[in-house]
Interface confidence: low
């Protein structure tokens, strides 16, 4: 039996290609170390987008990933993915692993469908 991970079903990226959504898990269990992985599902394949480990001392994650950022508070992670383009539209799953204290726990959300619409190019000005 895994932990329950919840995330919104649909998110629309901003015109700047930024999508933010929460990833929550329960129960909380006073966890000191939580690993969060964002995966993209295309057809039957899962691709890792970014991953990070949060601790009580390190609540800002994804420092190794320029296009991902996130903050951690108790049993909720606020995820932001930037630099998205229309081709990146797809299902993004949040995987949560409770690393410490043991026993190890893992759970996967049902996924957030992120829609990305490329901005219209600015028309040439007559001026």
């Amino acid at each position: 039996e895994a932990i329950q991970v919840t995330q919104p079903s649909v998110v629309l990226a901003s015109s700047h290609g930024v999508a933010s959504f929460p990833c929550e898990y329960s129960p909380s269990h006073n966890t000191d170390e939580v690993r969060v992985t964002v995966l993209r599902q295309t057809n039957d394949q899962m691709t890792e987008v970014c991953a990070t480990t949060f601790t009580e001392k390190n609540t800002v994650g994804f420092l190794d990933y320029p296009f991902c950022s996130g903050t951690f508070n108790e049993s909720r992670v606020n995820l932001t993915i930037q630099g998205l383009r229309a081709v990146d539209t797809g299902l993004y799953l949040c995987k949560v692993e409770l690393m410490y204290p043991p026993p190890y726990f893992v759970g996967m959300g049902n996924g957030t469908q992120i829609y990305v619409i490329d901005p219209e190019p600015c028309p040439d000005s007559d001026f």
Epitope: E1, N30, E33
Partner: antibody
Framework: EAKLQESGPVLVKPGASVKMSCKAS????????MNWVKQSHGKSLEWIGV????????SYNQKFKGKATLTVDKSSSTAYMELNSLTSEDSAVYYC??????????WGQGTLITVST | DIVMTQTTLSLPVSLGDQASISCRSS???????????LEWYLQKPGQSPKLLIY???NRFSGVPDRFSGSGSGTDFTLKISRVEAEDLGVYYC?????????FGGGTKLEIK
């Protein structure tokens, strides 16, 4: 207030098994890990293992694998530890203790197990 | 297994004095997540142990501020600034960073 109530003392014969209980109250049982600790007479403490009441996952001290089995009954908010093939070395006080930011934030009163013919 | 060594088995003190109890681990008990899971417990005669300090220096709720914990890596100390009669008993250190988690042998604090 969080409370852990352990079962009473037991006298058992060598080779037998014993199952002790730890009833939790005053908090949500499935939200916190439950540990078991052994204290032989006049000696220090030994960590036996821990169980996740939410899903029954366990982590054992290798020394107690095969000796101790940890289980829970969520409906009664009770943790159990069964010890098998008992010898005089198993005579001790056994404590349940709940995780809460620390491994043993809250303790039961202990169960005395005496193995003797 | 990590061995937790409390070299002082018995520590005689006068009431009102400061007491210092040391504990050494056989290897570093810094967890991979950066935390050090070093805890201190007091067991009075005929009672269950009680948590005093967790993660090296954090006092558990209800623990008087005369108790303080310090240390890093492999060397840790519990200090009691002014010993009171209710502080007498056996003090155990414990590491919860690496399985199997282990206790020290205990230091008995008694009246001089």
């Amino acid at each position: 207030e969080a409370k852990l109530q352990e079962s009473g003392p037991v006298l058992v014969k060598p080779g037998a098994s014993v199952k002790m209980s730890c009833k939790a109250s005053g908090y949500t049982f499935t939200d916190y890990y439950m540990n078991w600790v052994k204290q032989s007479h006049g000696k220090s403490l030994e960590w036996i293992g821990v169980i996740n009441p939410y899903n029954g996952d366990t982590s054992y001290n290798q020394k107690f694998k095969g000796k101790a089995t940890l289980t829970v009954d969520k409906s009664s908010s009770t943790a159990y530890m069964e010890l098998n093939s008992l010898t005089s070395e198993d005579s001790a006080v056994y404590y349940c203790a709940r995780y809460y930011g620390s491994w043993f934030a809250y303790w039961g009163q202990g169960t005395l197990i005496t193995v003797s013919t | 297994d990590i061995v937790m060594t409390q070299t002082t088995l018995s520590l005689p003190v006068s009431l009102g004095d400061q007491a210092s109890i040391s504990c050494r681990s056989s290897q570093s008990i810094v967890h991979s997540n950066g935390n050090t899971y070093l805890e201190w417990y007091l067991q009075k005669p005929g009672q269950s142990p009680k948590l005093l300090i967790y993660k090296v220096s954090n006092r558990f709720s209800g623990v008087p501020d005369r108790f303080s914990g310090s240390g890093s890596g492999t060397d840790f100390t519990l200090k009691i600034s002014r010993v009171e009669a209710e502080d007498l008993g056996v003090y155990y250190c414990f590491q919860g960073s690496h399985v199997p988690y282990t206790f020290g042998g205990g230091t008995k604090l008694e009246i001089k």
